[in-house]
């Protein structure tokens, strides 16, 4: 693999990792590939602190997250645990809610207008946050 | 000068195996993600397969998901597609691009293109 | 897969005309959708991505806007060497599709 020793243009670095923010909305799964195309992921966060830096620069817009339930459990898609690490959900979400009448629950977790998660419909196209580390050899993940 | 040259195209039979390659130069190579797009004789454009800079990720069209692979070895600025299984609508001149930079998959610079002819 | 249809299949027109051709998705999106052009045994070539935003090299004389399923590409003042074909492209979801191409010719 080969090391990111710094952040590609349009990129913004923070504690050694890079963000891009995106100015325009696509499905979850969507904004997911568009990321994996970048050799990034969806924003995994890992602390209060991430939280904060993310929320200054998205402001008050739904934007997805790399957190889902599609196959059952909550996870991260970097493989971060999600029992044990950082959440910061609105009172009352994760709900699963039913009642959108779009079929099916909210398997797709977002930033919400204050910065709180909630889940939502995937195929809602909301604006996304792409994050890679800085110094670490990319992985080779599975083929999509 | 950016510049894409494909290689490794040629008549082939139904079933059999081809691999192309494209070179790349004039850009830093490991840093774009590639396609591959496919244009049948008289037809219209395809987007085939997509590969991220590192070679982590890659994405297909269904028409060619489990026959065809996308690689690239960065040392050597090279894209490659592997493909087998071979069929008569896999007939087509095949082209290789490169992305722009923060967009998805608008493709900016283009090879000149590798005729692949599927045909007993 | 998102479809994509373009209107009309092929035109005929002179040096100088307006030139509008417009692009359908079988689903909305925003701002992922490119226009490219294509003459006779060569690669194609990016004129437009973003909907709107102009390829470096390209003339200002090409423009491109729409939202939603409806995009259009239009040529202010149609030139002897704009005379090709036009295709767009989505790339807001894998597979990221083309339209069949529209043939600009001479009248």
């Known amino acids: 693999g080969s090391e990111r020793t710094c952040c590609p243009v349009n990129w913004v670095e923070h504690e050694r990792s890079c963000y891009w923010f995106s100015r325009s909305g696509k499905a979850w799964a969507d904004a997911d590939n568009y990321c994996r195309l970048e050799d990034a992921h969806l924003v995994v966060v890992t602390s209060w602190e991430e939280q904060k830096f993310v929320q200054h620069h998205i402001g008050p817009v739904n934007t997805w997250m790399g957190l889902h339930d599609q196959n059952g459990p909550w996870k991260w898609v970097d493989g971060t645990d999600y029992e044990t690490g950082f959440k910061n959900w609105r009172p009352e979400q994760p709900d699963d809610w039913y009642g959108h009448g779009l079929g099916g629950g909210e398997d797709c977790a977002h930033f919400t207008d204050d910065g709180r998660w909630n889940d939502d419909v995937c195929q809602r196209p909301y604006r996304w946050v792409c994050e890679t580390e800085l110094d670490k050899a990319s992985q080779e993940p599975p083929l999509l | 000068e950016v510049q894409l040259l494909e290689s490794g195209g040629g008549l082939i039979q139904p079933g059999g195996s081809l691999r192309l390659s494209c070179a790349a130069s004039?850009?830093?190579?490991?840093?774009?993600?590639m396609s591959w797009v496919r244009q049948a004789p008289g037809k219209g454009l395809e987007w085939v397969s997509a590969?991220?800079?590192?070679?982590?990720?890659?994405f297909y069209a269904d028409s060619v998901k489990g026959r065809f692979t996308i690689s690239r070895d960065n040392s050597k600025n090279t894209l490659y597609l592997q493909m087998n299984t071979l069929r008569a609508d896999d007939t087509a001149v095949y082209y290789c691009?490169?992305?722009?930079?923060?967009?998805?998959?608008?493709?900016?610079?283009w090879g000149q293109g590798t005729l692949v002819t599927v045909s007993s | 897969d998102i479809q994509m249809t373009q209107s009309p299949s092929s035109l005929s027109a002179s040096v100088g005309d307006r030139v509008t051709i417009t692009c359908r998705a079988s689903?909305?999106?925003?701002?992922?959708l490119n226009w490219y052009q294509q003459k006779p045994g060569k690669a194609p070539n990016l004129l437009i991505f973003?909907?709107?935003s102009l390829q470096s090299g390209v003339p200002s004389r090409f423009s491109g806007s729409g939202s939603g399923t409806d995009f259009t590409l239009t040529i202010s003042s149609l030139q002897p060497e704009d005379f090709a074909i036009y295709f767009c492209?989505?790339?807001?979801?894998?597979?990221?599709?083309f339209g069949p191409g529209t043939k600009v010719d001479i009248k």
């Open positions: 691009a490169k992305k722009v930079v923060d967009t998805a998959m608008a493709l900016d610079y």
């Open positions: 004039g850009f830093t190579f490991r840093s774009y993600a």
């Open positions: 590969i991220s800079g590192s070679g982590g990720n890659t």
């Open positions: 689903q909305s999106f925003s701002h992922y």
């Open positions: 973003a909907v709107s």
């Open positions: 492209q989505q790339s807001y979801s894998t597979p990221f599709t």
